[in-house]
Interface confidence: low
């Protein structure tokens, strides 16, 4: 006869491991007992359990409550056992020794591999600001046994670097994603992908990129200078910019206070019917917690009685 077993049994942490040992004997042969032992190199043999044809299952005190026979129906020639709730410390070499009658003893070894699935974590880097050089966007760490694979899935252009730390029974892998921040990256997903044989599918953690920036400011409303004449109603200046965080707007007049009747509504400056006192230099100040910008325009209200062209100067400053 001969023993049938597996070279390697692989289970995920917390699952039950079936340690197979089946004696395929000739007609009339009987199995008297099956002894299971842990036989890691250099540590001698430690008995796990013994299945006796007459007296049943015996379990070592070290494994009390954790070793069982497979559920019935059972074949008398089947010496397999179940190791409940596998833990990392169970990983190692096991030996099955079968005593048969009349053929004698047979033995076989298998390796139990306990997979420890990773619990990945993603840590965003420091605040991203446009104008920075190569900057850490996020790091992703996963520890498991065997070592997990950590990669990145994103449309964003960047560079990755990985490092691994080996522990006694596991390995931690950290991957960093570096990029040069630009406003186009705002709202873009950066996904850490962790692969591991103990996972049914890859684990994915997504971080949404936030890049602080503030665009140059400009003022709209003076495109047709002939519209800015005495008596015109509904004249307005609009300050144009964009930023992250969204910017706030403030209007001032460089050559004095804002004239009475001029309304400030966020990015818009609304004028009452125009008079010559509305002529002047107006400044739009745009700011967020990242930066601030200014744009100034010169308004020259035309008197239709006069035959002179209006001058418009546009100046932007940071």
């Amino acid at each position: 006869g001969e023993l049938e077993t597996s070279d390697v049994v692989t289970v995920v942490l917390g699952q039950d491991a079936k340690l197979p040992c089946f004696y395929r004997g000739d007609s009339g042969e009987q199995v008297g007992q099956v002894a299971w032992a842990r036989v890691d190199a250099g540590e001698g043999a430690q008995e796990l359990a013994l299945l006796h044809s007459k007296y049943g299952l015996h379990v070592s005190p070290a494994y009390e409550g954790r070793v069982e026979q497979p559920p019935p129906p059972r074949n008398p020639l089947d010496g397999s056992v179940l190791l409940r709730n596998a833990v990392q410390a169970d990983e190692g070499e096991y030996e099955c020794r079968v005593s048969t009658f009349p053929a004698g003893s047979f033995q076989a070894r298998l390796r139990l591999r306990v997979l420890v699935p990773p619990l990945p974590s993603l840590n965003p880097g420091p605040a991203l600001e446009e104008g920075q050089g190569l900057t850490l966007a996020a790091s992703c760490t996963a520890e498991g046994s065997p070592a997990p694979s950590v990669t990145w899935d994103t449309e964003v252009k960047g560079t990755t670097s990985s490092r691994s730390f080996k522990h006694s029974r596991s390995a931690a892998v950290t991957s960093e994603f570096h990029l040069v921040p630009s406003r186009s990256m705002n709202g873009q997903p950066l996904t850490c992908v962790v692969s591991h044989p103990g996972l049914l599918q890859d684990q994915r953690i997504t971080h949404i990129l936030h890049v602080s920036f503030l665009a140059e400011a400009s003022v709209r409303g003076l495109e047709d200078q002939n519209l800015w004449h005495i008596g015109r109603e509904g004249a307005m200046l609009k300050c144009l910019s964009e930023g992250q965080p969204p910017p706030s707007y403030n209007w001032t007049r460089l050559d004095g206070p804002l004239p009475s009747g001029v309304r400030v509504d966020g990015d818009t400056l609304g004028f009452p019917p125009l008079t010559t006192e509305h002529s002047g230099i107006y400044v739009c100040h745009v700011s967020n917690e990242f930066s601030s910008r200014d744009s100034q325009v010169t308004v020259d209200v035309l008197d239709p009685q006069e035959d002179s062209g209006k001058q418009v100067d546009l100046v932007s400053a940071s």
């Epitope: 965003p124 605040a127 953690i205 997504t206 971080h207 949404i208 917690e289």
Partner: nanobody, 118 residues
Framework: EVQLVESGGGLVQPGGSLRLSCAAS????????MGWYRQAPGKQREYVAT???????NYADSVRGRFTISRDNSEDTVYLQMNSLRAEDTAVYYC????????????WGRGTQVTVSS
Amino acid sequence: EVQLVESGGGLVQPGGSLRLSCAASRSTFSLNIMGWYRQAPGKQREYVATITTGGSTNYADSVRGRFTISRDNSEDTVYLQMNSLRAEDTAVYYCTAELVRRGPTTYWGRGTQVTVSS
């Protein structure tokens, strides 16, 4: 899950002051940005102010110069000092916090009523 609990609302006369507080339940993760929104009857919820972990602040134009936001990172608490209150400041004030964990997740408090009336 992060819980946000506001306090400090009430009735105050125009020109008066109030200080709102918002305490976040302790989290093992960093609360990235905390701040305040408000909603007046019949109107949409509007932004008031926010503050980053580093103490950088941002305000809506309507409250700039009158309201001051501050933060105690060790307690995950944010404050809104409201001075020179006006009738138009009457609203339910909501605390908000963004949790950086697996991407930004925003949490909201239940709100505290502020009424400015003589």
